[in-house]
């Protein structure tokens, strides 16, 4: 039960996270005009990864796309790339994890395959989350640098009558959405990796032991132990007897060759 819950929760958390990463990538408010000096502005500027916008106090909003590719700052291109990589990895991870879910049966897919798929999707979610967090953090760092540079310019070179006051930008909503979404995707990925440990049947090293059935004969089903996924160390050897009590995680709905004694 715990493994199924962990896997399911990991999937849901990752799904929310990836949806958030997509939303953040599409949002226009990555940076917003700093209103510290002029809280009642007639023109409010904000910028995203793909276009910059102006909300006029008259109530109209106009956006202009970045139609150039080569003319854009390298950092912005890097952030775009990180976010897109994060989305692609996350989307593939979601696709893989759907088939890996314990509650979904596809033909006679072995638990080992599901465990491997769970691990794969988990790793993808972790990388996806890290990409998003990295992308947002790079953009935030760029904003902080530009903010202090424009602040410095604001208080120098004011000898003439004309003040070319630069518009300063601060963190927009998309940054916070991106950080939270990246974190959720990362947590979801970790949960999937943890679930993978519970899904993988442990490799048992059986010594030559003489079993004596007392009273009545017990049929032993030989072999068929699955190879360990190599994720974590398997110390417990679960011996499950036919007809014995099972935890919900160990119950299988169809007879299987993996009912071990």
């Amino acid at each position: 039960m715990a493994v199924t819950a962990c896997q399911g929760l990991g999937f849901v958390v990752s799904l929310i996270g990836i949806a958030g990463i997509i939303a953040a990538t599409c949002m226009d408010q990555w940076s917003t005009q700093d209103l510290y000096n002029n809280p009642v502005t007639a023109v409010f500027n904000y910028q995203g990864l793909w276009r910059s916008c102006v909300r006029e106090s008259s109530g109209f909003t106009e956006c202009r796309g970045y139609f150039t590719l080569l003319g854009l700052p390298a950092m912005l291109q890097a952030v775009r790339a990180l976010m897109i990589v994060g989305i692609v990895l996350g989307a593939i991870g979601l696709l893989v994890s759907i088939f890996a879910l314990k509650c979904i049966r596809i033909g006679s897919m072995e638990d080992s395959a599901k465990a491997n798929m769970t691990l794969t999707s988990g790793i993808m979610f972790i990388v996806s989350g890290l990409c998003a967090i990295a992308g947002v953090s790079v953009f935030a760092n760029m904003l902080v640098t530009n903010f202090w540079m424009s602040t410095a310019n604001m208080y120098t070179g004011m000898g003439g009558m004309v003040q070319t006051v630069q518009t300063r930008y601060t963190f927009g909503a998309a940054l916070f959405v991106g950080w939270v979404a990246g974190g959720l995707t990362l947590i979801g990925g970790v949960m999937m990796c943890i679930a993978c440990r519970g899904l993988a049947p442990e490799e048992t090293n059986y010594k030559a032991v003489s079993y004596h059935a007392s009273g009545h004969s017990v049929a032993y089903k030989p072999g068929g132990f699955k190879a360990s996924t190599g994720f974590g160390s398997n110390t417990k050897n679960k011996k499950i007897y036919d007809g014995g009590a099972r935890t919900e995680d160990e119950v299988q709905s169809y007879p299987s060759k993996h009912d071990y004694v």
Epitope: N38, A42, Q47, G59, F60
Partner: antibody, heavy 118, light 113 residues
């Protein structure tokens, strides 16, 4: 057709108040800011403030902040500008003007002359 | 507050000649978000309210004759009347819509020489 019709000329005593009205027609009154601008005889244009009738939000020029009150009545599509503690230098033509795309004043009322005289 | 300074205060031009009015802002009026300058030009004839001519520094309002044109960016702007007509005699004002309070230039009186 967009039209802004203002109330008639007023003669006021110093220290009193004046309330000028501006009736809008031909557009969705609640969806556009309404500005008030004044022009003293032979002088330039001076922005006083604005109101968004849909919400009642207002913005005022610092110069008039303490003396001007701008209101709007959505039911009659009318904006009002009240100026208190009148002085002789408040003698001017007061205009209402719709605020539009590009932060411009695209339609103007015909103006209301307010004369402050003892 | 943003200060707009128009020059000259008055201008006399012969009919059919070119008239140029300047407007200088104490601060940039260029918006980074849409790369537009929030400067507007109005024409006011005696006894009438102002009439919108040009917005965003260079966009002509519909119905305005094409002899009127606006140019400039940042802090320096120009209104040009390519061929002055008798009906163009008026006072011309520039106005900024970039920051509150909204401000106007002091006006330029255009007359026929």
């Amino acid at each position: 057709e967009v039209q802004l019709v203002q109330s008639g000329a007023e003669v006021k005593k110093p220290g009193s108040s004046v309330k000028v009205s501006c009736k809008a027609s031909g557009y969705a009154f609640s969806n556009y800011w309404m500005n008030w601008v004044r022009q003293a005889p032979g002088q330039g244009l001076e922005w006083m403030g604005q109101i968004y009738p849909g919400s009642g939000d207002t913005k005022y020029s610092g110069k008039f902040q303490s003396r001007v009150t701008i209101t709007a009545d959505k039911s009659t599509s009318t904006a009002y500008m009240e100026l208190s503690s009148l002085r002789s230098e408040d003698t001017a033509v007061y205009y209402c003007a719709r605020f539009y795309y590009g932060n411009v004043m695209d339609y103007w009322g015909q103006g209301t002359l307010v004369t402050v005289s003892s | 507050d943003i200060v707009l300074t128009q020059s000259p205060d008055s201008l006399a031009v012969s009919l059919g000649e070119r008239a140029t009015i300047n407007c200088k802002s104490s601060q940039t009026l260029l918006s980074g978000g849409n790369q537009k300058n929030y400067l507007t030009w109005y024409q006011q004839k005696p006894g009438q309210p102002p009439k919108l001519l040009i917005y965003w520094a260079s966009t002509r309002e519909s119905g305005v004759p094409d002899r009127f044109s606006g140019s400039g960016s940042g802090t320096d702007f120009t209104l040009t009347i390519s061929s002055l007509q008798a009906e163009d005699v008026a006072v011309y004002y520039c106005q900024q819509g970039y920051s509150y309070p909204l401000t106007f230039g002091q006006g330029t009186k255009l007359e026929i020489k």
